[in-house]
């Protein structure tokens, strides 16, 4: 059987990013996203 390992040789850093909702619409409050490897994914 083939064995698959996730071992890319480098660390993928993640960081929480916070945006204000009113910058992108009419809502108030904060939008919290997660940036992984330079891409905002959530």
């Amino acid at each position: 059987d083939a064995e698959f390992r996730h071992d890319s040789g480098y660390e993928v850093h993640h960081q929480k990013l916070v945006f204000f909702a009113e910058d992108v619409g009419s809502n108030k409050g904060a939008i919290i996203g997660l940036m992984v490897g330079g891409v905002v994914i959530a």
């Epitope: 990013l17 916070v18 009113e22 910058d23 904060a30 996203g33």
Partner: nanobody, 124 residues
Amino acid sequence: EVQLLESGGGLVQPGGSLRLSCAASGRTFNNYNMGWFRQAPGKGREFVAAVSRSGVSTYYADSVKGRFTISRDNSKNAVYLQMNSLRPEDTAIYYCGAAYRGTAINVRRSYDSWGQGTLVTVSS
């Protein structure tokens, strides 16, 4: 770009309060989300709080939530940080910053204008 000048720092006992002010010059003040960061001796600059362009929305670091309140007065081009229940670990230089709309408000790289900072020392 706006120019920023902080004031209101000083020496306060644990459990005490201080109100920091940040005066902004420039006609584009309400195009910017405004934030406070702090830098303790030997440490990096960390996010404290931010307020949206309108003043309606705010966001706080977990370490200050419930103790600090950020606000702004667009008619006076000013931002404020009311700090209550101060602790020794709040000792730092506090910086006011301006971040253009749509950028992440909790990270230093979003801020393109900074004041010179005001020192807050919490000690008995």
